[in-house]
Amino acid sequence: IWELKKDVYVVELDWYPDAPGEMVVLTCDTPEEDGITWTLDQSSEVLGSGKTLTIQVKEFGDAGQYTCHKGGEVLSHSLLLLHKKEDGIWSTDILKDQKEPKNKTFLRCEAKNYSGRFTCWWLTTISTDLTFSVKSSRGSSDPQGVTCGAATLSAERVRGDNKEYEYSVECQEDSACPAAEESLPIEVMVDAVHKLKYENYTSSFFIRDIIKPDPPKNLQLKPLKNSRQVEVSWEYPDTWSTPHSYFSLTFCVQVQGKSKREKKDRVFTDKTSATVICRKNASISVRAQDRYYSSSWSEWASVPCS
Amino acid sequence: RNLPVATPDPGMFPCLHHSQNLLRAVSNMLQKARQTLEFYPCTSEEIDHEDITKDKTSTVEACLPLELTKNESCLNSRETSFITNGSCLASRKTSFMMALCLSSIYEDLKMYQVEFKTMNAKLLMDPKRQIFLDQNMLAVIDELMQALNFNSETVPQKSSLEEPDFYKTKIKLCILLHAFRIRAVTIDRVMSYLNAS
């Protein structure tokens, strides 16, 4: 058993049918010695008397808010949460496996640049009685500071019969140098509590591996005289690291017909312009990627050909 | 013509071209190592990230773009940097800093070259003959060193008398390739920046 925060405790249980559970001793936070009784949650049934209460915690029915009283007055509370270990592996009931980029990906994180700022998000089908708390650091043995905000509900969507809820959090490394070569990964730890169930999720990454630039901005077409060709031009996104000659991007320019089945023409360039043939009803899209370290491509920025 | 150390402009293109080749070569070699050594811990998540140049060279610091010298996090533990003189850089200081930067890159390349050659000698003794260093990558390191045109005493290749532990050597190869790829990215960024300056 360990303390999650003041008066909230997590009991770790080897979770299998007929498991013996864990013996837990609760102590009433009071100078009083006599006439103390204990109850669980809203029930008035007295579970025991005395300054300490010994309980065998086996299932969720044994978890909850234990309260010690004296003469009708509440002395203190202890909330017991359960953390299930199923055959050597901590349970992951609360969050959805996003399966991207690989199985057992519960937290996904992205950074728009090398400033040390990043966003993580996760999915759940649970809508109520749910709380998250997020901590982060650079490295784990001698951790360096990363500050995270509060996790917020960022999207809701319907998936088949189920509603899916997306939560996200923004974090910032306290002293980040964009040009630094990372040797210690960023660690992100999310504590999730649903009703009386506690779970924790972790992700470990280098900022360089989670880079996803914003789409190029100011995408414009300039028709070339006496030609079906157009000059496409764009600019680096405002959120990208500077100077751009050091933090260079490479670009992919795509001409896409109205029908998804039509052949796509693609050009790759390090410049911020390209000459392409603009077909009728087609659209031109441009996306960006770090020129030297192949992390994710940005989303597409698009303009119609007409 | 080889790069006269102090002047960034006309001769920078060959260095930029060579540094791009270097990044391509080390990335290909790393990919090959990860595929060939699939039963070894060779992914970025599994290896310890060690930098063999740590405390010996200071490429990131010496080659820091001027625009980042205002960022205090980039100035920690820095003996050398593009120190601003008022609002602009004195040209002699620029030349001096650039020389420091390029010589630091040269020293990096020399250290990695020695490590890779030593390692290749060990890998050639492996009865499994599972993996060897790409000769193209070694050649590209050499070409960039020549383009940088520094004279420095040759470091003797490390020779080891004890029987090599091939498992450890292959893991060391992965660690080395990951670190060298990150350094090659930095070198590419620096060359691109100097080329644009």
Partner: antibody, heavy 115, light 112 residues
Framework: QVQLVQSGGGVVQPGRSLRLSCAAS????????MHWVRQAPGKGLEWVAF????????YYADSVKGRFTISRDNSKNTLYLQMKSLRAEDTAVYYC????????WGQGTMVTVSS | SYVLTQPPSVSGTPGQRVTISCSGG????????VKWYQQLPGTAPKLLIY???QRPSGVPDRFSGSKSGTSASLAITGVQAEDEADYYC????????????FGTGTKVTVLG
Amino acid sequence: QVQLVQSGGGVVQPGRSLRLSCAASGFTFSSYGMHWVRQAPGKGLEWVAFIRYDGSNKYYADSVKGRFTISRDNSKNTLYLQMKSLRAEDTAVYYCKTHGSHDNWGQGTMVTVSS
Amino acid sequence: SYVLTQPPSVSGTPGQRVTISCSGGRSNIGSNTVKWYQQLPGTAPKLLIYTNDQRPSGVPDRFSGSKSGTSASLAITGVQAEDEADYYCQSYDRGTHPALLFGTGTKVTVLG
């Protein structure tokens, strides 16, 4: 006393369907994940499927994906395996088992797919 | 396709020490716990070892398990006639959990 009692096995022709049941008692069935495991005659153990305690997630072996469906009725304390498009290679003893460091197995039920 | 490899058979005379190996990889045994089962002919498997080296109550102490790196082993010290059975190791793969990964199985024969 934890008990898993299986039923529903038998002889079936290729291409036909069969549903296996596993009735649980002696524990809070709705709190635990459950597996199906099979063993072809003279062969080793092969995992077939898993279902979470609340039925929210189901996992299948590639060999049965799209043909077998694992389900549970927590109000009846029963686990099911619906098998469709059966093949000769599905012939095996099928076991249900609880998920956890200590596990309990059903007695097994024989499924024979033969024309 | 079995990813956990066991020897097809091992044998010993009563009182001898018999060991069965179970070889896997970094993503299974290397990152997860191992169980061992005993299966007597015509019966369901019985748990012998859980969490690499733990014995459930009721399992004789002549059975012991261990794990090192990407391999595990089961030892029977002082093998007895009633130990003649099939033995299976089981683990998980970190990418496919909760799918059970079984070993190929080992037939233990007690001679004489």
